[in-house]
Interface confidence: low
């Protein structure tokens, strides 16, 4: 016996968030892994008085304590619909079925005399049917439904007389069913029987407040189990050759402070006082845990030395329950001021360390959904995925000997103190129906797939490819708005006067009259901030730099009456100095952010993008920029993520769609102007960049979620892409969806109607497709009332906690970008595509491993799109150059310009042009390739200001 559970809270220093196997493991379970599902008799059988069954303490408790619950008589009626249960088991394809025998169905008053024939026949028929189907039965003798007569006559488990009566009942079951049953569970979760039955009064028999009674009940449950184990071991195991255990349930808990000894001590105490209370006598040294003995000496019964010897080792495996009943209500649990957690993997590790690595059967695991959820139990899939992933990690990475898993539960049924307000079944049952059909929920389909594949197969992504991007591929980095320096920070050589220093007198400088020195013209390097930009860009080794102008700085009045020439000079310097390093600019004219619209004040006060005249003001601004910078800039983005301005213009859907309309017109006007006036001489290309996250159905078994995923893309991307790239009008699917909601009175939104002239204006006003892609969203359909863009979509998002995610909860899902690129090509034809922003926030200030992982994986998928799918991908711009103070850390450089290690990683990908084969030598010609100029770099770094 080792008892070293507390070591689990000393965190593994080798944990790295980008080793995805430590978050989610794509692997299979051991070859003969035992897949099962469970029910409790009282929860599903119904027929509480039928065919001679006696009342249980729960039948009585329901009638006396639970409001609004008539009885368990309805439930799923498994007693009547046995065949339907068997069909459900067949559907899922389990290896075992764990069910419990209702003690009062066999012996109505609890005492073992002549068994109730109908009850005996029911269980016998069930066992025969399971054996016939090759489904192993795991039979629980006591799942909380004590015959009421024993409670009334003896006081239930408070009285040690029950121990022998329970042993008689067990003996009868071994005799009648043992030929067909190889796995026995004596008692299901004795902690809850004692704690909630006699402590909080939340469970039958509903007694509360007497701590001595709680621990007496626990004591008798342990002794009852031990007696039955010895009975089976001596009289039945030799010929029946089965195994017997007791199911012990627990929560899991994490310390508030992972390095704090006191907090870790409290966590150990918390686990010991729930799981250890029963596990220590049975799986440990035969006695209660030392901490409990000290703390509860006045109420905790004592085991004699002989009893300790008798208790110890009375389980053939460790049967473990981990589900909501041990977590709620939490304030009745030994929380000890620490943080309750659903980390099953850590709980299993604790069992391994505390009880010397036993073989473990997970005898109950799952969560719950609201009673109104029918067959689309999406969150249940993710809970199951998370739990199963943790079990798999425990087996594969921690070498824990888990040999089986019981999903809970087969059917919706009576959920103890929650009665019928929650559901835990993988099959939906309408309790008010006559036929009680078992309808498979999404979780049933999911579990079936897990069993069929014996784990998680990596179907989402294809293997990495080796290959390179084309020589003219733009390797970029994106920055948001560059605020121009209003005055050059370095004005030396601009003052023509000579001064002498009065060193001995007043220590001031005095101008020497009549002397004029030669000045030098202003230089780009007078701007300190440009020097910083160039240093960073040079280290990035990129070929392209995408940054945004500040409209409000260039045109403070919003029109051409007051042009800030200094700002334009600053931007021209950024571009020209970059070109000296071989770095071309992609310039964004307008880059609004959630916090700041970035409009000139007068336009902001005139209703911003709700005012159509803003579009004309934008055209004038764009014309000025094309004129002043267009000889140097060949790639233009008019507006960054106009499809995200819905976050700001969100008072109503009509505001959102009105603003979007004006943004589209603004872009089109600017593009037409460039096309007409500047393209002939400047030969550049103009587009707008759309926020383009991919969407997947949160629940792949629900048609409504597939439709929601496509609808997300229509509302998010097609909303702007369709009018510009294709038809000149909004997507028909989006228009029809909003109109349909309007007709049903669910929304008063409407997409603007476009005139023929507007359609002609918009259509075809892009020279390339620019997409900002960061993540993939998991979406589900949920009908939402209201007249806002967000509710018009009828979409909710789900966070998959098994996915690698950033601090701002951006999920790392590389294959989403490839799907996006294919979707764009399928919908909008074969055109040049630039990914104009793509990146992740990473807390690390130096070794930003998450960002390196993200870049490598996402660029792999972009390369697949290029090599395999033949998508015309022209460039990838990593987001972003430098982080901003107190914002999520997206930068390659910190806010005080310190370089992170992802820069070297990106350098390597750029210099290799992707992921070439070993010894690949397909270098580009000197003119095409952006060679790093060491002298240039030296000059940039050393040039005096």
């Amino acid at each position: 016996f080792s008892g070293d559970g507390r070591a689990i809270w000393s965190k593994n220093p080798n944990f790295t968030p980008v080793n995805e196997s430590q978050l989610f493991l794509y692997d299979t379970f051991p070859k003969n892994f035992f897949w099962g599902i469970g029910t409790g008799a009282l929860q599903v059988e119904g027929s509480w008085k039928k065919d001679g069954k006696g009342p249980s303490i729960w039948d009585h408790f329901i009638h006396t304590h639970l409001k609004n619950v008539s009885s368990t008589n309805g439930s799923s009626d498994s007693y009547i619909f046995l065949e339907k249960d068997l069909s459900a088991l067949d559907f899922i394809g389990v290896s075992f079925y764990q069910f419990s025998i209702s003690w009062p169905r066999l012996f109505p008053d609890g005492i073992v005399t002549v068994a109730n024939a109908k009850g005996l026949q029911y269980y016998s028929t069930l066992l025969d049917a399971l054996v016939l189907r090759n489904i192993e039965p795991i039979v629980t003798l006591y799942h909380w439904d004590l015959p009421l007569a024993l409670q009334e006559k003896y006081g239930g488990w408070k009285n040690d007389t029950i121990i022998d009566i329970f042993n008689d009942y067990a003996t009868y079951c071994f005799q009648m069913f043992g030929d067909r049953v190889k796995y026995w569970i004596t008692i299901h979760n004795p902690y809850l029987v004692a704690w909630h039955g006699y402590g909080t009064g939340m469970h039958a028999p509903g007694e509360k407040g007497n701590l001595a009674a709680v621990y007496t009940v626990g004591h008798n449950l342990i002794k009852a189990h031990s007696k039955v184990w010895h009975n089976y071991n001596t009289h039945f195991r030799p010929h029946q050759k089965g195994w017997l255990s007791i199911t012990l349930g627990s929560h899991w808990i994490e310390p508030n402070r992972s390095e704090n000894t006191m907090d870790i001590f409290k966590c150990q105490q918390s686990m010991v006082s729930v799981l250890g209370w029963f596990a220590n006598p049975i799986h440990g040294d035969g006695d209660y845990p030392e901490g409990m003995r000290k703390k509860l000496f006045s109420v905790l019964p004592i085991f004699s030395e002989a009893e300790k010897h008798e208790m110890r080792g009375t389980a053939d495996f460790f049967a473990f329950s981990f589900g909501p009943n041990n977590f709620k209500p939490l304030n009745t649990m030994a929380k000890m001021g620490q943080n309750v957690s659903l980390n099953l993997r850590e709980a299993l590790n604790w069992i391994k360390l505390e009880y010397n690595n036993p073989r473990i059967l997970i005898a109950e695991n799952g969560w719950f959904t609201d009673s109104r959820v029918k067959t689309e139990d999406t969150t249940a899939i993710y809970m199951m995925k998370n739990f199963l992933s943790q079990v798999l990690q425990a087996i594969r990475l921690d070498e824990i000997r888990v040999f089986g898993y019981t999903a809970w539960s087969l059917l919706d049924g009576f959920e103890w103190q929650d009665a019928y307000t929650i559901r835990r079944g993988l099959f939906y049952v309408d309790f008010n129906s006559k036929q009680k059909e078992r309808k498979p929920k999404s979780s049933a389909h999911y579990y079936k797939q897990i069993i069929r594949e014996n784990g998680f197969s990596l179907k989402e992504s294809t293997p990495d490819v080796q290959g390179q991007f084309p020589c003219d591929f733009s390797w970029g980095v994106t920055e948001s708005v560059l605020k121009p320096e209003s005055v050059a920070s370095s004005p030396q050589f601009s003052d023509p006067h000579l001064y002498v220093w009065n060193a001995t007198g007043n220590r001031l400088l005095h101008r020497v009259e009549g002397v004029r020195l030669k000045t030098r013209p202003a230089q780009c390097t007078d701007f300190v901030n440009i020097k910083k930009q160039l240093e960073m860009l040079a280290r990035m080794k990129v070929t392209h730099y995408r940054f945004a102008l500040d409209w409000a700085s260039v045109l403070p009045t919003g029109n051409l009456s007051a042009v800030n020439r200094q700002a334009l000079r600053y931007y021209r310097c950024v571009v020209s100095e970059g070109l000296k390093l071989g770095i071309s600019a992609m310039v964004t004219l307008y880059y609004p952010t959630h916090a700041h619209l970035g409009l000139p004040e007068p336009l902001l006060h005139a209703d911003g993008w709700l005012n159509p005249s803003t579009a004309e003001a934008f055209q004038a601004y764009a014309g000025l920029c094309f004129q002043e910078l267009g000889d140097l800039v060949k790639l233009w983005i008019t507006i960054n993520e106009p499809n995200r301005l819905s976050d700001i213009y969100n008072r109503s859907g009509n505001d959102t769609y009105g603003a979007a309309h004006n943004l589209l017109v603004a872009h089109a006007l600017a593009w037409r102007l460039y096309d007409r006036q500047f393209r002939p001489s400047q030969r550049g290309a103009v587009s707008l960049s759309l926020h383009a996250d991919w969407a997947e159905p949160a629940n792949p078994y629900a048609d409504s979620h597939w439709r929601a995923a496509e609808r997300f893309l229509q509302f998010e991307i097609a909303w702007f892409a369709e009018p510009l790239f294709k038809t000149g009008d909004y997507p028909a699917a989006m228009r029809e969806y909003i109109a349909s909601k309007h007709r049903r009175g669910l929304s008063s939104s409407a997409l603007p109607r476009l005139t023929e002239a507007e359609r002609r204006l918009l259509k075809g006003t892009v020279d390339f497709c620019a997409l900002n892609h960061f993540t993939t969203r998991f979406v589900m359909h949920e009908q939402l009332a209201g007249s806002r863009y967000d509710s018009d979509r009828d979409i909710q998002f789900l966070q998959d906690i098994t996915r690698l995610s950033s601090p701002t909860r951006l999920a790392v899902i590389p294959w989403g970008v490839r799907k996006l690129l294919r979707w764009v090509r399928r919908n909008y034809g074969d055109m040049d595509i630039y990914i104009t922003a793509s990146g992740i926030d990473d807390q690390a200030l130096e070794d930003d491993r998450l960002r390196k992982y993200y870049l490598g994986k996402y660029l792999q998928e972009v390369l697949k799109a290029y090599l395999i799918d033949k998508v015309r991908i022209k460039g990838y711009y990593a987001f972003k150059l430098a982080e901003e103070k107190s914002k999520p850390r997206f930068g390659f450089f910190t806010s005080d310009f310190k370089a992170k290690s992802s820069i070297q990683f990106y350098n390597k990908v750029i210099s290799s042009r992707g992921f070439p084969f070993e010894n690949s030598s397909s270098r580009c010609s000197q003119t095409q390739e952006n060679t790093e100029c060491t002298v240039c770099l030296f000059l940039v770094q050393k040039k005096p200001l």
Epitope: F327, P329, N331, T332, A334, K335, M336, N339, V340
Partner: antibody, heavy 124, light 109 residues
Framework: QVTLKESGPVLVKPTETLTLTCTVS??????????VSWIRQPPGKALEWLAH???????SYSTSLKSRLTISKDTSKSQVVLTMTNMDPVDTATYYC????????????????WGQGTTVTVSS | SYVLTQPPSVSVAPGQTARITCGGS??????VHWYQQKPGQAPVLVVY???DRPSGIPERFSGSNSGNTATLTISRVEAGDEADYYC???????????FGGGTKLTVLG
């Protein structure tokens, strides 16, 4: 963003019934992890919890006011309604509705978003 | 039913640390939430589940809970922290929300 807004009469006569409506936006009352409480605060006094409605439509009421309170919700309208019968001048207070979110089981993480409150005066 | 006891007032000089207590029978096994309420405004959640901070709440606000006392600690107190503070728990046995009587924090000077 998530908002809650209370509405109802400013003035109520003694013995009348008060009906208050909390209209929510930015989240769904269908959400299995969300509940809404009503709380009141008489002038210059402490907060007093009145009632709560859980995601599964279960209700819970303050023991001292249970006989006078009814809480309900209309998910389609995104509204939670509280009625309080037999009003008395001592019921003069600012009435707030607030959202609670569940993180595990039936365990709430505090009331993370509150309405701005509506002041009700009971006077003849 | 469950009762939470708070001191009616606490005074502290700017820059110092304020500690507001909330007493309750074995409160350490409950989850305690803390709210700040400024005059004429709705309460704002500043600490939940004993010690967690919602986004947007400064790190100066922290909480702890053990035994029979939960504590809200405000370090480097500023004039803008002057407000009423309430503790709250869910009484799981009755499914009732329980608030403390509130503590008025006064920032001196």
């Amino acid at each position: 963003q998530v908002t809650l807004k209370e509405s109802g009469p400013v003035l109520v006569k003694p013995t009348e019934t008060l009906t208050l409506t909390c209209t929510v936006s930015g989240f769904s009352l269908n959400n299995a992890r969300v509940g809404v409480s009503w709380i009141r605060q008489p002038p210059g006094k402490a907060l007093e919890w009145l009632a709560h409605i859980f995601s599964n439509d279960e209700k819970s009421y303050s023991t001292s006011l249970k006989s006078r309170l009814t809480i309900s919700k209309d998910t389609s309208k995104s509204q939670v309604v509280l009625t309080m019968t037999n009003m008395d001048p001592v019921d003069t207070a600012t009435y707030y509705c607030a959202r609670s979110v569940v993180t595990g089981g039936y365990y709430y993480d505090g009331m993370d978003v509150w309405g701005q409150g509506t002041t009700v005066t009971v006077s003849s | 039913s469950y009762v939470l006891t708070q001191p009616p007032s606490v005074s502290v000089a700017p820059g110092q640390t304020a500690r507001i207590t909330c007493g309750g029978s074995n409160i350490g096994s409950e989850s305690v939430h803390w709210y700040q309420q400024k005059p004429g405004q709705a309460p704002v959640l500043v600490v939940y589940d004993d010690s967690d901070r919602p986004s947007g709440i400064p790190e100066r606000f922290s909480g702890s809970n053990s035994g029979n006392t939960a504590t809200l600690t405000i370090s480097r107190v500023e004039a803008g922290d002057e407000a009423d503070y309430y503790c709250q728990v869910w009484d799981g046995n009755s499914d009732h929300v329980v608030f403390g009587g509130g503590t008025k924090l006064t920032v001196l000077g």
